[in-house]
């Protein structure tokens, strides 16, 4: 099966790599613009230069192209806790990330929020915190894992998942509750 090509890709495939077909004259292949520039005007004829101009501040192109305008630089989402790792240049978009000891939680393919890595208090680190994943904790005896935090078994109710982990403690607590003074 041949993958479906858009009109632009179909037209480009007529020309050798690094060139595109002139939009008004399909017998002319124009040289694409270098990254960091955009297409201001198509080449006037075969073997003549394409008129490429440098992207202005706040915009970029990251690869060779024949875009009529540069792409707007991304802005890091402060409300999501993001910080700028590297600023936008004419040939590279802004790189956003999280602070040290934080990880990215992706709400969608391109949107992430920064959260603090769990410290595994009352437990041990099973897997260290990574760029896109929180620390995985293993809890000490008498504690169970809830939302990646080690919580005392005294907070475990029979209806919750923790009952298996905290079974001896629950029986203990239950016994204490039942024994009244005579």
């Amino acid at each position: 099966l041949v993958p479906h090509l858009g009109d632009r890709e179909k037209r480009d495939s007529v020309c050798p790599q690094g060139k595109y077909i002139h939009p008004q004259n399909n017998s002319i292949c124009c040289t694409k613009c270098h990254k960091g520039t955009y297409l201001y005007n198509d080449c006037p004829g075969p073997g003549q230069d394409t008129d490429c101009r440098e992207c202005e501040s706040g915009s970029f192109t990251a690869s060779e192209n024949h875009l009529r305008h540069c792409l707007s630089c991304s802005k890091c989402r402060k409300e999501m806790g993001q910080v700028e790792i590297s600023s936008c240049t004419v040939d590279r978009d802004t790189v956003c990330g999280c602070r040290k000891n934080q990880y990215r939680h992706y709400w969608s393919e391109n949107l992430f929020q920064c959260f603090n890595c769990s410290l595994c208090l009352n437990g041990t680190v099973h897997l260290s915190c990574q760029e896109k994943q929180n620390t995985v904790c293993t809890c000490h005896a008498g504690f169970f894992l809830r939302e990646n935090e080690c919580v005392s078994c005294s907070n475990c109710k029979k209806s919750l998942e923790c009952t298996k982990l905290c079974l001896p403690q629950i029986e203990n607590v239950k016994g204490t509750e039942d024994s009244g003074t005579t």
Epitope: Q24, N41, P44, D49, H69
Partner: antibody, heavy 118, light 108 residues
Framework: EVQLLESGGGLVQPGGSLRLSCAAS????????MSWVRQAPGKGLEWVSS????????YYADSVKGRFTISRDNSKNTLYLQMNSLRAEDTAVYYC???????????WGQGTLVTVSS | EIVLTQSPGTLSLSPGERATLSCRAS???????LAWHQQKPGQAPRLLIY???SRATGIPDRFSGSGSGTDFTLTISRLEPEDFAVYYC?????????FGQGTKVEIK
């Protein structure tokens, strides 16, 4: 010989519209970027808008973005500037200019005066 | 945007003298995309110099341009009576294209 002839200027009230035309001859019109540049009375030159040879790319000064539209008809060798929501500060002589390939404005028309006043 | 500042605002000289006009850019002009235009009263501008130092077609060799980056100069080696006019520098490397405010060369 390259010739550029502007028309369509005149007196218009604030908020009004006007369409300027520029008839070009003496060169292969469709391969060159064409532009509009204006000059307020007694002032310097201000670039307004440009359009690529194919008409696919258009570029505007912030002062006119969203109000002015540049277009061209390569079959008629004519450049246009549709000006809407005109303001007093748009009063100027509007020049049509040809851009040299990869270059500056190498030929200018004689200009057409646009006056925005009530 | 790139702001172009021309100096002096007015230059009062006699025919036969040398004129030196300056144009300073607020940031580097890419690939020396700088031009000089001449405008006489009631007329359209005329291109003199492009690419910082190349003379346009039909421009006499008494006009010369130099400079790169942020500092550019237009020199008229010997002023002729028809050279008294306003001169504008223009950059066309970074959108929006911008002009200097102009230098008027007047007869002393």
């Amino acid at each position: 010989e390259v010739q550029l002839l502007e028309s369509g200027g005149g007196l218009v009230q604030p908020g009004g519209s006007l369409r300027l035309s520029c008839a070009a001859s003496g060169f292969t019109f469709s391969t060159y970027v064409m532009s509009w540049v204006r000059q307020a009375p007694g002032k310097g030159l201000e670039w307004v808008s440009s359009i690529s040879g194919s008409g696919l790319g258009s570029y505007y000064a912030d002062s006119v973005k969203g109000r002015f539209t540049i277009s061209r008809d390569n079959s008629k060798n004519t450049l246009y500037l549709q000006m809407n929501s005109l303001r007093a500060e748009d009063t100027a002589v509007y020049y049509c200019a040809k851009e040299a390939h990869r270059g500056p404005f190498d030929y200018w028309g004689q200009g057409t005066l646009v006056t925005v006043s009530s | 945007e790139i702001v172009l500042t021309q100096s002096p605002g007015t230059l009062s000289l006699s025919p036969g003298e040398r004129a030196t006009l300056s144009c300073r850019a607020s940031q580097s002009v890419s690939s020396s995309y700088l031009a000089w235009h001449q405008q006489k009263p009631g007329q359209a501008p005329r291109l003199l110099i492009y690419g910082a130092s190349s003379r346009a077609t039909g421009i006499p060799d008494r006009f010369s341009g130099s400079g790169s980056g942020t500092d550019f100069t237009l020199t008229i080696s010997r002023l002729e009576p028809e050279d008294f006019a306003v001169y504008y520098c223009q950059q066309y490397g970074s959108s929006p294209w911008t002009f200097g405010q102009g230098t008027k060369v007047e007869i002393k």
